[in-house]
Every structure is written in structure tokens, then in C-alpha cells.
């Protein structure tokens, strides 16, 4: 009875050895495996078993040449040949690699399937075991982040379109009670690209919407600001002295009304004062204090509280000037000193005036949001690397390159 159990164990091990070696030399892996391709060139395709047993997944199964030879001699695939001295193996020259034409690539694509829903701690062996009864699988690619963490999704290449279709159409597939999302690889990328595109469109529309809302708020605030300033404008005009300046106006109204802004340039014959309170009151107080005769540098002046459309236009201009002044101040990153046009408005706080823009990488949430490697629609100047990590190589070669096609 125990012997029977041992036989079963041995048969299972041999099947795994065959499967692993046939994967290494198979249609899918071999064209992508730099190291193995180099080895094949050296001796008419023969690769010493000494080298083969350094491949991690085979190494984990056995390092015994006899076991490997025995296993391969029983293989029904008849892909591999064993040298007479039983120390080397090669892919049978009667089974050459298919020519990698567009037609062949298309065929592979059409039998490639995306499966999502595996726990991120699932191993390749777990997945292989799950796929065991699901059709003939040529390659399993565990999709990983740049930091090599498994994402919980895989690409599987079946041996035929029929077996891929059969798998995809099997309802209610689960991995340990977890529902899976199963799509042909092509359709997965279509879904992902659609998601990306939609989210981009949404983000743009949203930004536009927020911009419009912001603009409306600003306009509302401006209107409110205008309303608050109604009746606060005082126009002055006359044959003014060329040396008349803003300071004269501040002195004249110093105790009668707080001046927010003066629209006046030296040498002009008229200007406008914006008071915090009603202009009429400030003018009245100033007149009273000056016996009814309010002059600038001993020159007669006509004083007029603005109203109606004239007032609105003047207010708009003042608000624009204030904004312009504020922007200038911001860009210079320091306080103005009362120079330039109309600038006795209180300046904003003491910020350094620096604006930092931080680069922002957009991530699309749904599905594989952290899809650093991505075929189709790769962004940026460099086409992103294939998601082909966990390459099987002799240990000595492993840190040097990750050139394989999958995780088998």
C-alpha cells in the first residue's frame, strides 16, 4: 500500500518536472528567454542538465539527473530529446518554434485571458493548481506592481482559442469562494482604456465645473463688493496744481473719512477717492472743518459724490486696478511702497508670494489602479516594460536580468 502511494507521488513529481521543462522550452517562454536562447546556440540546441537544475522552479522539484531523464522519457508531449549520455536535453528539432508573425501574435492574443480576484498572497503554485482542470495552459503571468507585489490578477495563455473560450464562458468561477472577473485580455485592455478615458473626461469636466463655480463666486463677491461701495466715491476736479499728490488728499480728509483707494496720477486735473464709508459724510465733515471751502494746494476744486452708471463704471475700474495692483504685488513677492497708480490700499499679509506647483500623477481607481506596467495605451515617452517578472533563471543569472514571459 505504501509502495503504491510512493508510486503516485513519483508520478506526480515526474508530471511536474515535465511540465516545467516543457514550459522552459515551450513556444511561449523560449522566444522570450535570453539566457536559454544563448545556451541553445552553443551546442546544437543541447543544454546541460547541470545548467537546467539551476533554474529555480526545477531546482525546487529535483536536482537528480536520473529523475529528470526518467520523467522526460515518459512525456506524452514529445517536445524534448535526451542526449545519449543522459546529461543534456534539447527541444526536438522536429518541433521548431513557430514563426513570430502578426498572425501568430494575434492567435496568442486571442487565447490570452485576464483573471482578477486572487488574494495578493496567492502563489504561482496555488494558481497553477486552481487552473489544473480548466484547460491546457501554456503560460501564467502573475501581474505585479513595480515593487514586485502580486496584484491579484493574472494573464493566462491557453493552448487554443477553443479552450480559452470554454474557460471564459464557464459561469460562476470562483477562487476559494471569491467571485472572479474573467475577460479576454484584449477586452480587459479595452475596459481599462475606457475607464481611463472616461475618468480623464470626467476630471476635465469637473475641473471646468469647479472653475466656473469659482468664477461665479468671484463675480458674486465682486457684485457684493460693488454694492458695499455704492455712495463711497468722491470725484474731484479743477485747475489743480501740478504738484498735487495723493498725500494732499490724505491730509485733507485725515480726520473725516478713511480712504481706501485714490485713482489719481500727479499732473492730472481730476481724480476719484474711494472712502470706506459714505463719501457724502466725509465730504461734509471735511467742508465743515474748512469753513465750507475745500481746496487742494490753494486751488479751487469741484467735489462731486458719484451716482448711477458713472459711479458703477468708476467702481469697476477701481476694482480692476486694485486687483492688478494685488497681482503685481504677489508676483514681486514684496510690499509696494505707494508707488504707481492709485495705490494707497492696504496691502495683503506678509506671505513670501511663492506658489509651488506639485506634479500630480493621475491614478485611475477602478480595477488595477496601481498598474505600473501596462500594455496598450502606455503613457509617457517610453513604452512600459512588459509585466514579466519572477523569471526562471539559474541563480547566478537572476539578479542580472528579468527577461522572461511569465511566472511558470
Amino acid at each position: 500500500m505504501a509502495e503504491n502511494g510512493d508510486n503516485e507521488k513519483m508520478a506526480a513529481l515526474e508530471a511536474k518536472i515535465c511540465h516545467q521543462i516543457e514550459y522552459y522550452f515551450g513556444d511561449f517562454n523560449l522566444p522570450r528567454d535570453k539566457f536559454l536562447k544563448e545556451q541553445i546556440k552553443l551546442d546544437e540546441g543541447w543544454v546541460p542538465l547541470e545548467i537546467m537544475i539551476k533554474f529555480n522552479r526545477l531546482n525546487r522539484l529535483t536536482t537528480d539527473f536520473n529523475v529528470i531523464v526518467e520523467a522526460l522519457s515518459k512525456s506524452k508531449a514529445e517536445l524534448m530529446e535526451i542526449s545519449e549520455d543522459k546529461t543534456k536535453i534539447r527541444r526536438s528539432p522536429s518541433k521548431p518554434l513557430p514563426e513570430v508573425t502578426d498572425e501568430y501574435k494575434n492567435d496568442v492574443k486571442n487565447r490570452s485571458v485576464y483573471i482578477k480576484g486572487f488574494p495578493t498572497d496567492a502563489t504561482l503554485d496555488d494558481i497553477k493548481e486552481w487552473l489544473e482542470d480548466k484547460g491546457q495552459v501554456l503560460n501564467i503571468q502573475m501581474r505585479r506592481t513595480l515593487h514586485k507585489a502580486f496584484k491579484g490578477s493574472i494573464f493566462v495563455v491557453f493552448d487554443s482559442i477553443e479552450s480559452a473560450k470554454k474557460f471564459v464562458e464557464t459561469p460562476g468561477q470562483k477562487y476559494k469562494e471569491t467571485d472572479l472577473l474573467i475577460l479576454f485580455k484584449d477586452d480587459y485592455f479595452a475596459k481599462k482604456n475606457e475607464e481611463r478615458k472616461q475618468n480623464k473626461v470626467e476630471a476635465k469636466l469637473r475641473a471646468k465645473q469647479e472653475q466656473e463655480a469659482k468664477q461665479k463666486l468671484e463675480e458674486d463677491a465682486e457684485m457684493k463688493s460693488l454694492e458695499e461701495k455704492i455712495g463711497c466715491l468722491l470725484k474731484f476736479s479743477g485747475d489743480l496744481d501740478d504738484q498735487t499728490c495723493r498725500e494732499d488728499l490724505h491730509i485733507l480728509f485725515s480726520n473725516h473719512g478713511e480712504i481706501k483707494w485714490i485713482d489719481f496720477v500727479r499732473g492730472a486735473k481730476e481724480g476719484i477717492i474711494l472712502f470706506k464709508e459714505k463719501a457724502k459724510e466725509a465730504l461734509g465733515k471735511a467742508k465743515d472743518a474748512n469753513n465750507g471751502n475745500l481746496q487742494l494746494r490753494n486751488k479751487e476744486v469741484t467735489w462731486e459724490v458719484l451716482e448711477g452708471e458713472v459711479e458703477k463704471e468708476a467702481l469697476k475700474k477701481i476694482i480692476e486696478d486694485q486687483q492688478e495692483s494685488l497681482n503685481k504685488w504677489k508676483s514681486k513677492g514684496r510690499r509696494f511702497k505707494g508707488k504707481g497708480k492709485g495705490n494707497k490700499a492696504a496691502q495683503p499679509g506678509s506671505g513670501k508670494g511663492k506658489v509651488q506647483f506639485q506634479g500630480k500623477k493621475t491614478k485611475f481607481a477602478s480595477d488595477d489602479e496601481h498598474d505600473e506596467h501596462d500594455e496598450n495605451g502606455a503613457t509617457g515617452p517610453v513604452k512600459r516594460a512588459r509585466e514579466e517578472t519572477d523569471k526562471e533563471e539559474p541563480a547566478s543569472k537572476q539578479q542580472k536580468t528579468e527577461n522572461g514571459a511569465g511566472d511558470q
Epitope: K116, G117, V168, E177, T178, D179, L180, L181, I182, L183, F184, D186, D187, F189, A190, K191, K192, N193, E194, E195, R196, K197, Q198, N199, V201, E202, A365, S366, D367
Partner: antibody, heavy 116, light 106 residues
Framework: QVQLQQSGAELARPGASVKLSCKAS????????ISWVKQRTGQGLEWIGE????????YYNEKFKGKASLTADKSSSTAYMQLSSLTSEDSAVYFC?????????WGQGTLVTVSA | QIVLTQSPAIMSASPGEKVTMTCSAS?????MHWYQQKSGTSPKRWIY???KLASGVPARFSGSGSGTSYSLTISTMEAEDAATYYC?????????FGGGTKLEIK
């Protein structure tokens, strides 16, 4: 601007079949999925299936296999859904919708009434 | 398939009131999407990827949640918010919708 334009209302006899259409416009992707969603009067939404314009592959909700058949005409960017062996249970509004993993765009819906 | 259960099925709120509706999944999902549907019209994507507002959706709406529990909140109810809201997941085929929450104005 993505738009999904669906065909007009259908009145059919029990046992008959109807074929609804959904024309997509305003999109640059060559391969994308069009889903079909059923809504009975005063009821919720049920996903019937999805067909991909580029690959021609279709995916079905098990519940609607044998009832709905999805096809697509690549050249006219039109998706079709044929409903067969109609019963009163099939009386509903059928929407086509587009999206990644959510449905950002919807057709206006086609009302199917099954009545003897 | 994943079953989504929405509660309450029907609710009413006064203008200005805060409204919260929930969506519970029979197993864990990564993201939840929400749709608004008014009588006689197509559903509109309202919130996607759990918390992102679709364009045109007022900022008073928000979405949150993780795992099996998700919610949609309106900070201050307005008359135009009266509609039926559906949650939806697509973590696996078939994608499924919740039964809907009908929100009425008091």
C-alpha cells in the same frame, strides 16, 4: 461627446423575437464594451451582458443566456440585442450603456411590451 | 454573484436636511458606483470609484465606504435631489446593482 442612440419602442406577441439596436457615436476607441441593462416597471436594474466592438467577444449574465443574444456591427458602431421566446416577464425598458467598470454613458432606453 | 442590498428602500427628507443611504455587499468589493435615476429617464452615473463625483453633480453629494459597506450622503437635501439612487459593483461578472433607494422630498 459620447452618445448612445437606441431604437424605438417594440410591441411583440408572446413567443416572438425582437432585435434592439444601440448606435454609439463620438468616441475614438476602437475596442470598447457595450452593455445591456434591463429595467422592469418600478423595478431595479439588471445587467444582461456586454459585447466588445473590436474583438466581437460577448459576456452574459447566466440568467439571460438563451434569452438574449448580443451582436455588433463594427462598421456602423452599432450593437444589437435579440430577445427571443418573449414572455410577459420580458416586458421592460432595455438600456444600452458604456463604461469601464461603471456606466458613464447610457442610451435613452427602448420599451419592449409583450402582449397577446 | 455579489448581491448588493440598499437601505432604506424608501426615505423622505426635508429641504436642508442631511441624507445618508447605504449599500451593503454580500462579499468585499474594491469600489462602489452610484447612479441617480428620475422617473422616465435613463440612470446617470452620479458617483464613481466610491467617492468621485461625476461632472455636474453638486458638491453637497459625497460617497464613502470600503469592503462590504458603502454609503452616499447629501449634506443638505434639495428638491432636485428627489430620485432613486442605485449602487453598482463590477468586481466580478456579472456586475450587479442594488435594489435602489427612493428618496422623496417632504
Amino acid at each position: 461627446q459620447v452618445q448612445l442612440q437606441q431604437s424605438g419602442a417594440e410591441l411583440a406577441r408572446p413567443g416572438a423575437s425582437v432585435k434592439l439596436s444601440c448606435k454609439a457615436s463620438g468616441y475614438s476607441l476602437t475596442n470598447y464594451g457595450i452593455s445591456w441593462v434591463k429595467q422592469r416597471t418600478g423595478q431595479g436594474l439588471e445587467w444582461i451582458g456586454e459585447i466588445y466592438r473590436g474583438s466581437g467577444n460577448s459576456y452574459y449574465n447566466e440568467k439571460f443566456k438563451g434569452k438574449a443574444s448580443l451582436t455588433a456591427d463594427k462598421s456602423s458602431s452599432t450593437a444589437y440585442m435579440q430577445l427571443s421566446s418573449l414572455t410577459s416577464e420580458d416586458s421592460a425598458v432595455y438600456f444600452c450603456a458604456r463604461g469601464g467598470l461603471s456606466f458613464a454613458y447610457w442610451g435613452q432606453g427602448t420599451l419592449v411590451t409583450v402582449s397577446a | 454573484q455579489i448581491v448588493l442590498t440598499q437601505s432604506p428602500a424608501i426615505m423622505s427628507a426635508s429641504p436642508g436636511e442631511k441624507v445618508t443611504m447605504t449599500c451593503s455587499a454580500s462579499s468585499s468589493v474594491t469600489y462602489m458606483h452610484w447612479y441617480q435615476q428620475k422617473s422616465g429617464t435613463s440612470p446617470k452615473r452620479w458617483i464613481y470609484d466610491t467617492s468621485k463625483l461625476a461632472s455636474g453633480v453638486p458638491a453637497r453629494f459625497s460617497g464613502s465606504g470600503s469592503g462590504t459597506s458603502y454609503s452616499l450622503t447629501i449634506s443638505t437635501m434639495e428638491a432636485e435631489d428627489a430620485a432613486t439612487y442605485y449602487c453598482q459593483q463590477w468586481i466580478s461578472n456579472p456586475p450587479t446593482f442594488g435594489g435602489g433607494t427612493k428618496l422623496e422630498i417632504k
